[in-house]
Interface confidence: low
């Protein structure tokens, strides 16, 4: 056997090159046949009425043919025949790759409660061979469950991801990434997770600066409440007592001028948003006017309440971003 060919893999719509090579030539006729065993070329003559086949090279040692605008129907075995005695035959297999036509993420629901499992589906349509779908949450790879549907030699792959959502997922993209031999680099689409959570409350003493509250001094407390959405209500209350008459409330700030011992107690900043409520307590102790040995400073304690965290999903589809996954992993 001195007739050789090589298998060809080509992307749909591109050009396939078929080569029949003879090692020891004796000027025998070389013929190329299609999968239906119709003659495409007999030496340098093309009897087949398909102008997509063009002769690239013809000699006693090689018949080289190009096939333009390859379609999936062109797939199969192409036969090279060498008219020696006895005749020799070798075949080359043309494999046509079809990239996925479309990549879509479908989310079961727009909002989800933290701790709940949501279903995310990604579909890569009409590819050949079947597409491999990979899932990432940020830079962490997750496992999806894929189902393949075949129709007319083409494959539609749907991958289902069951994702348990957490507050920490806020702003993290869920990425559906496609790997396919007909796609250079990574084809991907993603959704950014937006997590809503109850406020986190922190009280800061902005006056006095040294943190020691004495009779006759002024006190200024600022309540910082961070949540998503931003807390709509920030209120000050005095726990188990009325707010002093000389206390001034201004938004997140609490001012108490001319402190006296009757002001001792716990002052609570409460914040709420649509998700839930939280609070932080400041325990005020008013000390005597200055002495030689300063007593210990006042303390702040924070308490939060158990509430529900909501997740909202915002769409942001991007395709063909290469190298976007490697960057970070933990």
């Amino acid at each position: 056997q001195n007739l050789f060919t090589k298998d060809v893999t080509v992307i749909e719509g591109e050009v396939a090159t078929i080569s029949c090579q003879v090692n020891k030539s004796d000027d025998s006729v070389i013929q190329l046949l299609n999968p239906n065993r119709q003659t495409i070329y007999f030496r340098d003559f093309r009897p087949l009425k398909d102008s997509r086949f063009q002769l690239l090279n013809f000699s006693s040692s090689e018949l080289k043919v190009s096939l333009t605008n390859v379609s999936i129907s062109d797939e199969g075995r192409y036969f090279c025949q060498l008219y020696t005695d006895p005749p020799q035959e070798s075949y080359t297999t043309i494999t046509v790759l079809v990239p996925p036509r479309n990549l879509m993420i479908d989310i079961q629901k727009d909002t989800a409660v933290e701790g709940e499992e949501i279903e995310v589906n990604c579909t890569a349509m009409a590819s050949k061979p079947a597409t491999t779908i990979r899932w990432f949450k940020g830079n962490t790879e997750l496992k999806g469950k894929s189902e393949v549907e075949e129709w007319s030699d083409m494959y539609t792959v749907t991958s289902q991801l069951m994702l348990k959502v957490h507050k920490e997922d806020d702003g993290v993209p869920v990425i559906c990434q496609v790997e396919h031999p007909a796609v250079t680099g990574n084809l991907q689409t993603q959704r950014y997770l937006e997590v809503q959570y109850k406020p986190q409350v922190h009280i800061q003493m902005t006056y006095p600066l040294q943190g020691l509250t004495r009779e006759g001094d002024a006190l200024e407390l600022t309540c910082e409440a961070i949540g998503k959405p931003q807390p709509v209500m920030v209120t000050w209350v005095r726990v188990d007592d009325e707010m002093p008459q000389h206390a001034v409330l201004s938004g997140p700030n609490l001012f108490i001028n001319n402190l006296n011992k009757t002001d001792n107690g716990t002052y609570r900043c409460e914040a709420s948003n649509i998700v839930g409520k939280a609070h932080s307590d400041y325990m005020l102790y008013v000390y005597d006017p200055p002495t030689t040995i300063p007593p210990p400073t006042t303390t702040t304690t924070t308490t939060t309440t158990t509430t529900t965290t909501i997740l909202t999903i915002i769409t942001d589809s991007r395709a063909g971003e290469e190298g976007s996954i490697r960057a970070v992993d933990h």
């Epitope: 962490t140 790879e141 490697r326 933990h330």
Partner: antibody, heavy 111, light 107 residues
Framework: EVQLLESGGGLVQPGGSLRLSCAAS????????MYWVRQAPGKGLEWVSS????????HYADSVKGRFTISRDNSKNTLYLQMNSLRAEDTAVYYC?????????WGRGTL | QYELTQDPAVSVALGQTVRITCQGD??????ASWYQQRPGQAPVLVIY???DRPSGIPDRFSGSTSRNTASLTITGAQAEDEAHYYC?????????IFATGTKVTVL
């Protein structure tokens, strides 16, 4: 040759500090997340810390959080682990490892 | 906090098949990888992505996962396969976790 080579291990008193280094060669260091994994004598493997390819993100096991610091110098192809406030239970062979979401290359370790 | 559990030790006759299992809830969500560690040596990756084998790893090593259990199978165990095998995955925060490991003895 693709390899990782750790150094910097040694004997240290409780409360002391050590800095481990891991020199990478034979691959594009700046493209890979890197890790430290340790193994106490006669025990199993324990993940210690991770760092992203750029160095922008770091993660630590609870057992070392606040005491150990992972860092990298991509211009020198080197990974570091600064270990402070060392305890007897930190005694182990420390391996540096490379990978995406699994460890596909390991160093020989430093004790 | 997720945990992975493996049998501490398993024995196999030379040329026979041995299956090591690793159980944990994280295996429902995250890929498992398996590492071989011979005495006095660094670990070596033998299986990743549940069932993919790195180049250079003999095809007698294979992996699979069903629900919360990952398995490493050595078909036709050789003397050089005697080692500790560790399963690795992620916890709920995405941090790596290793199982305690299984010592495989080839008889």
């Amino acid at each position: 040759e693709v390899q990782l080579l750790e150094s910097g291990g040694g004997l240290v008193q409780p409360g002391g500090s050590l800095r481990l280094s891991c020199a990478a060669s034979g691959f594009t260091f700046s493209r890979y997340p890197m890790y430290w994994v340790r193994q106490a004598p006669g025990k199993g493997l324990e993940w210690v810390s991770s760092i992203s390819s750029s160095g922008g993100l770091t993660h630590y096991a609870d057992s070392v959080k606040g005491r150990f610091t992972i860092s990298r110098d991509n211009s020198k192809n080197t990974l570091y682990l600064q270990m402070n406030s060392l305890r007897a239970e930190d005694t182990a062979v420390y391996y540096c490892a490379r990978g995406d979401w699994y460890f596909d290359l390991w160093g020989r370790g430093t004790l | 906090q997720y945990e992975l559990t493996q049998d501490p030790a398993v024995s196999v006759a030379l040329g026979q098949t041995v299956r090591i299992t690793c159980q944990g809830d994280s295996l429902r969500t995250y890929y498992a990888s398996w590492y071989q560690q011979r005495p006095g040596q660094a670990p070596v990756l033998v299986i990743y992505g549940d069932n993919d084998r790195p180049s250079g790893i003999p095809d007698r090593f294979s992996g699979s996962t069903s629900r919360n259990t990952a398995s490493l199978t050595i078909t036709g165990a050789q003397a050089e396969d005697e080692a500790h095998y560790y399963c690795n995955s992620r916890d709920s925060s995405g941090n790596h976790i290793f199982a305690t490991g299984t010592k495989v003895t080839v008889l």
